[in-house]
């Protein structure tokens, strides 16, 4: 059974802001204008690494920066989860693990992140631009999905950035408030861009970083602003598709909606959102999708001789939220 | 939308079993929970189990031995089967679906209920 | 076993009238994210339940803002600032927080 504060929380690898120090202000606003976008929703961050002792072998940690109780993490590779990519892992905080090969060992590292060690010999060992994808699924948040692979030239040791930039994003808008220095910040914000609206914007390039290896940084958000400051960059394509494996297929089932609870006035028949309000997106590459009560369409990974089952511990038990953090 | 659809009223005898479906439709199956609620004629409402497909049930202890909450997930369904069954069984059965995966409640969605009578 | 207690049984409503309806239980429902993990429902004359306030006070989608809830650790209350005729039934509040779950025993709305 997993309770509260059962491990410590662990944090991310940071993104990087280079040159912050030298657009000190023409970065405030954009820095703003990401608090205001983003406060109060959660990101999910992954981290895809090439062992160096095993070229072909690979660690994929994600992890979920926000206040919910998790219930659900799935580890897929060649895409989202719903969108042609094939599940890996799927890990319950209460009910167990359950992995189809090429994974090799999926595990809870705290509880809010995971990693997952997939094997590397075989027709379905992954190469190294695969995509590999992480969806949380949270109250209140709803379900978050971000991607991230290894770049084709990436040294053995080395690990690609973190990908905080979430493909499903859900938010009970509204559910943890707007500060009044926030509320300020924005207004502040909205100052700085009429100032400033015909000054090129800065570049905010994420910069590469092992966890091994903490560097030095000209400018580091807050660890309180951590969950809401983020870096968001496009999700790699890969050009490279796992081998088809026999013990998990592809989804090929339509999407689907579930039901919402929300606070219209009808129950709406397509995706909506728990709150009325609805997150921005920052960028065209982040889609805005509100998956709490709206969960992508997937058919089930087929049991098969690459299934590990994690036995289900039976009966009654002590549950820490209702999704599942018991 | 997704929507529950349950199977047909059941009149049993004494220390036989039965067994209730609930089909999802329109939605993803393996890794939601679907709980099975009881309501006997006049009285309130009673949490019997639930079942996560990918990874197995759990169940009440009151039920614990008598109850099986299995899932099929090439049909997307859901049985709830009840052994050794005694005229206080006597219950209309819901299978209801939280919204959200791995999460058990609030049941945002209900089968429209089976009725079940045990009578010799 | 969190055990759910509700009161009234009872409860004879006069249209356009408000009504509350307490639920209390042996245990706190607060759960570390700072939400409470109550739900209520309303089960209509012949009708499976439907979901109508969860976590302590968030309105489920199509619940009309007549209805709301409050309340935090072991004492909750739903409110209708107004009774309509088609709120007639059977309530119920149902803890999620800890297995197994449990649900009140349930208060009955009925028209003068």
């Known amino acids: 059974m997993r309770t509260e504060a059962q491990v410590p929380a662990l944090q991310p690898p940071e993104p990087g802001l280079e040159g912050a120090m030298g657009h000190r202000t023409l970065v405030l606003p954009w820095v703003l204008l990401t608090l205001c976008v983003t406060a109060g929703t959660p990101e999910v961050w992954v981290q895809v690494r090439m062992e160096a002792t095993e070229l072909s072998s690979f660690t994929i940690r994600c992890g979920f920066l926000g206040s919910g109780s998790i219930s659900l993490v799935t580890v897929s590779w060649g895409g989202p989860n719903g969108a042609g990519g094939t599940t890996l892992a799927v890990l319950h905080p209460e009910r167990g693990i359950r992995q189809w090969a090429p994974a090799r060992q999926a595990r809870w590292e705290t509880q809010s992140s995971i990693s997952l060690i997939l094997e590397g010999s075989g027709a379905s060992s992954p190469c190294a631009n695969t995509t590999f994808c992480c969806k949380f699924a949270s109250f209140p948040e709803g379900s978050w999905e971000a991607c991230g692979s290894l770049p084709p030239s990436s040294d053995p040791g080395l690990s690609a950035p973190p990908t905080p930039a979430p493909i499903l994003r859900a938010d009970l808008a509204g559910i943890l408030g707007v500060s009044g220095v926030l509320l300020f910040g924005c207004v502040y914000l909205l100052h700085l861009l009429r100032r400033h609206k015909h000054r090129p914007a800065p570049r905010l390039q994420p910069s590469r970083t092992s966890p091994q290896a903490p560097r030095a940084r000209a400018w580091a958000p807050s660890q309180a602003s951590q969950a809401a400051l983020h870096v968001p960059y496009a999700t790699i394509n890969t050009s490279c598709r796992p081998a088809t494996l026999d013990t998990a297929h592809p989804h090929g089932g339509p999407s689907w909606w579930a039901s919402l609870p929300t606070h219209a006035a009808h129950r709406p028949q397509g995706p909506a959102a728990w709150a009325s309000t609805p997150i921005p997106a920052r960028g065209s590459f982040v889609s805005v999708e509100n998956g709490l009560y709206a969960q992508a369409g997937e058919r089930p990974p087929h049991t098969g001789p690459g299934l590990t089952l994690f036995p289900d511990p039976r009966g009654p038990r002590a549950m820490e939220g209702p999704l599942g953090v018991r | 939308q997704v929507q529950l659809v349950q199977s047909g009223a059941e009149v049993k005898k004494p220390g036989s079993s039965v067994k209730v479906s609930c089909k999802a439709s329109g939605g993803t199956f393996s890794t939601f929970a679907i709980s099975w609620v009881r309501q006997a004629p006049g009285q309130g409402l009673e949490w019997m189990g639930d079942i996560i497909p990918i990874f197995g049930s759990n169940y009440a202890q009151k039920f614990q031995g008598r109850v099986t909450i299995t899932a099929d997930e090439s049909t997307s369904t859901a049985y709830m089967e009840l052994s050794s069954l005694r005229s206080e069984d006597t219950a209309v059965y819901y299978c209801a679906r939280g919204p959200l995966e791995g999460k058990v409640s609030p049941f945002d969605i209900w089968g429209q209920g089976t009725m079940v009578t045990v009578s010799s | 076993d969190i055990v759910m207690t509700q009161s009234p049984l009872s409860l004879p409503v006069t249209p356009g009238e408000p009504a509350s309806i307490s639920c209390r239980s042996s245990?706190?429902?607060?759960?570390?994210?700072?939400?409470?993990?109550l739900d209520w429902y309303l089960q209509k004359p012949g009708q499976s339940p439907q979901l109508l306030i969860y976590?302590?006070?968030t309105r489920a989608s199509g619940v009309p803002d007549r209805f709301s809830g409050s309340g935090s650790g072991t004492d909750f209350t739903l409110k209708i600032s107004r009774v309509e005729a088609e709120d007639v039934g059977v309530y119920y509040c149902?803890?999620?927080?800890?297995?197994?779950?449990?649900f009140g025993g349930g208060t009955k709305v009925e028209i003068k």
């Open positions: 149902m803890q999620e927080r800890q297995f197994p779950i449990t």
């Open positions: 976590v302590g006070s």
């Open positions: 245990q706190s429902l607060l759960h570390s994210t700072g939400y409470n993990y």
